[in-house]
């Protein structure tokens, strides 16, 4: 696996954060400049699940 | 419940090798990235690498480059650390760590949500 | 490398003070900053991630601020159990860099 090393030393350009397309399940994470796993947020006062926008004030989950 | 458990650290000579190993439960590393961060004694913290197991993704502080690598199994749900020739100044507790992400528009709202106990690491003569 | 400068290294308080530390970025990282609280022996607990939002679990007491290159964790009214240290941590660019953290002592 080490072989497919991502050079992100000589990727640090201003761009890191823009998300590229992720699936449904997935965000784009700047640290490793690839799509992860990304959970949503729960909203204690109604239960619902959302995803997280600036200005909110949710807890996550629980674990995963 | 989530778990992360070292394994592999001890007392080793100075040019010496040691690999460490972080075994993951309660879910899949291949979702996440892990990473292992060390902390000299007295210390603060200081990251050490990471790997995005699902593309085999690395990097590495430029204090370790070189002489660490970082890999992972997924089949074993568990993340490694090969450490090479050795030097007094890595002599340390090994954490390994998930770092979790939620959706905030698309982009990895995150941090190390889940640590490890550690696993010291000791080079000496 | 990102360069995170926190302050003070140290201070000193009373159980019911309200503590701030700041962390300050070499660049502008937005608000991908973490913080965490680590007691002797332990492993470091998350408290806030995206520079704002409150992981699970944690006391409503913590909460943190900032954006771009200057942020701030406070502490409303210090608990017992909050005597510790606490570091900030960037995610914007890899490598992830610590700041040096900053010890919470009883006056």
């Known amino acids: 696996m080490g072989a497919r090393r991502l050079r992100v030393r000589s990727q640090r350009s201003r761009d890191s954060s823009v998300p590229t397309q992720c699936n449904q399940t997935e965000c784009f994470d700047p640290l490793v400049r690839n799509c992860v796993s990304c959970e949503l947020f729960h909203t204690p006062d109604t239960g619902h699940t959302s995803s997280l926008e600036p200005g909110t004030a949710l807890q996550p989950q629980e674990g995963s | 419940e989530v778990q992360l458990v070292e394994s592999g650290g001890g007392l080793v000579q100075p040019g010496g090798s040691l690999r460490l190993s972080c075994a993951a439960s309660?879910?899949?590393?291949?979702?996440?990235?892990i990473h292992w961060v060390r902390q000299a004694p007295g210390k603060g913290l200081e990251w050490v690498a990471w790997?995005?197991?699902?593309?085999?993704?690395?990097d590495y502080a430029d204090s370790v480059k070189g002489r660490f690598t970082i890999s992972a199994d997924t089949s074993k749900n568990t993340a490694y650390l090969q450490m090479n020739s050795l030097r007094a100044e890595d002599t340390a507790v090994y954490y390994c760590?998930?770092?979790?992400?939620?959706?905030?528009?698309?982009?990895?709202?995150?941090?190390?949500?889940?640590w490890g106990q550690g696993t010291l690491v000791t080079v000496s003569s | 490398d990102i360069q995170m400068t926190q302050s003070p290294s140290s201070l000193s308080a009373s159980v019911g003070d309200r503590v701030t530390i700041t962390c300050r970025a070499s660049?502008?990282?937005?608000?991908?900053v973490a913080w965490y609280q680590q007691k002797p022996g332990k492993a470091p607990k998350l408290l806030i991630f995206?520079?704002?939002y409150l992981y699970s679990g944690v006391p409503s007491r913590f909460s943190g601020s900032g954006s771009g290159t200057d942020f701030t964790l406070t502490i409303s009214s210090l608990q017992p159990e909050d005597f510790a240290t606490y570091y900030c941590?960037?995610?914007?660019?890899?490598?992830?860099?610590f700041g040096q953290g900053t010890k919470v002592e009883i006056k």
């Open positions: 760590a998930r770092r979790v992400c939620y959706n905030r528009l698309g982009v990895c709202a995150g941090g190390m949500d889940y």
């Open positions: 309660g879910f899949t590393i291949s979702s996440s990235s």
């Open positions: 790997v995005l197991p699902s593309v085999g993704f690395t």
């Open positions: 660049e502008d990282i937005s608000t991908a």
């Open positions: 995206a520079a704002s």
């Open positions: 941590q960037q995610s914007q660019i890899s490598p992830p860099t």
